[in-house]
């Protein structure tokens, strides 16, 4: 019953972070969450930071600056994969959840 | 010092295909993403495709995307563009260039290959 | 897709001439503006990225600047081996890479 429930976890975190992904930048709050996801967990987009890319509000070569390994302003504007993040949250958060709930 | 070839370019006629190649030498191909990019005779600058570090990320101009192809082997240090539908508009050098992203502009271009689509 | 519109398309000096070409961007791009300096039969080379920063190697007369929409590339005084085709280039929003039209500097 524990990992049913987990899974279930795990699928809810997947479609709410890829919901708040396609409100992104547009609505504050969900950018202001997103972005501290991001930055705390060292990760980016859902699956991979290739999830941004299907965000029509988000030129398809940008990132959330909160992607990039080292933090400045437009740093996500016409990223080189080398300098962000490519592991998606969903997986990096969920093995976060595991070990800590 | 670092070095961009293209090869593989020639005449081919309305409807052939094309495999073009770009060997580098000199830096760290993982570390950029790579263009081909075209100049017709007589004509500007075209951007025709480009591919991220890894290979992920692979976008087309309009005018040649479902034709062409672009892929990269990080192995053999290697970029290429396979052309299939070729028609006379594709008629240009095409040039292989390195793109280090961000503020940056594209800072080495091969010295380019000539394709000539004709019958 | 961000156009981008050079002027003047052509230009005659002469050698030792102050030289100012212009590169308009349809939208805003903020400084992500590239100029390439491009001799016949060769491939084009950077001379300028980020709108003002100079590409090592390229001789200091050779500067940029502008942000936002508009954009200038001067040569403070024209040297015989700057007679070229010179191009901008957005990398703002891609794809697609944008170029502009070119402009061709001549020999008066």
């Known amino acids: 019953a524990g990992y049913v429930f987990r899974d279930k976890v795990m699928s809810e975190f997947n479609n709410n972070f890829r919901q708040q992904m396609e409100n992104y930048p547009k609505n504050n709050h969900t950018a202001s969450i997103l972005d501290r996801m991001q930055a705390d967990f060292k990760c980016c987009g859902a699956a991979n930071y290739t999830d941004w890319e299907k965000i029509p509000s988000m030129s398809k070569n940008r990132v959330p600056d909160s992607c990039c390994i080292n933090v400045t302003v437009g740093c996500g504007i016409n990223f080189n994969e080398k300098a962000i993040h490519k592991e998606g949250c969903v997986e990096k958060i969920g093995g976060w959840l595991r070990k800590n709930v | 010092q670092v070095q961009l070839v293209e090869s593989g370019g020639g005449l081919v006629k309305p409807g052939g295909s094309l495999r073009l190649s770009c060997a580098t030498s000199?830096?760290?191909?993982?570390?950029?993403?790579m263009n081909w990019i075209r100049q017709a005779p007589g004509k500007g600058l075209e951007w025709v495709s480009y591919?991220?570090?890894?290979?992920?990320?692979?976008y087309y101009a309009d005018s040649v995307r479902g034709r062409f192809s672009i892929s990269r082997d990080n192995a053999k240090n290697s970029l290429y563009l396979q052309m299939s539908s070729l028609r006379a508009d594709d008629t240009a050098v095409y040039y292989c260039?390195?793109?280090?992203?961000?503020?940056?502009?594209?800072?080495?271009w091969g010295q380019g290959t000539t394709v000539t689509v004709s019958s | 897709d961000i156009q981008m519109t050079q002027s003047p398309s052509s230009l005659s000096a002469s050698v030792g001439d102050r030289v100012t070409i212009t590169c308009r961007a349809s939208?805003?791009?903020?400084?992500?503006l590239n100029w390439y300096q491009q001799k016949p039969g060769k491939a084009p080379k950077l001379l300028i990225y980020?709108?003002?920063s100079l590409q090592s190697g390229v001789p200091s007369r050779f500067s940029g600047s502008g942000s936002g929409t508009d954009f200038t590339l001067t040569i403070s005084s024209l040297q015989p081996e700057d007679f070229a085709t010179y191009y901008c280039?957005?990398?703002?929003?891609?794809?697609?890479?944008?170029f502009g039209q070119g402009t061709r500097l001549e020999i008066k």
């Open positions: 591919i991220s570090n890894s290979g992920s990320i692979r």
């Open positions: 000199g830096f760290t191909f993982t570390d950029y993403f």
């Open positions: 980020a709108a003002s």
């Open positions: 939208q805003s791009i903020s400084s992500y």
């Open positions: 280039q957005q990398s703002y929003s891609t794809p697609p890479i944008t």
């Open positions: 260039v390195r793109d280090p992203r961000q503020i940056y502009g594209m800072d080495v």
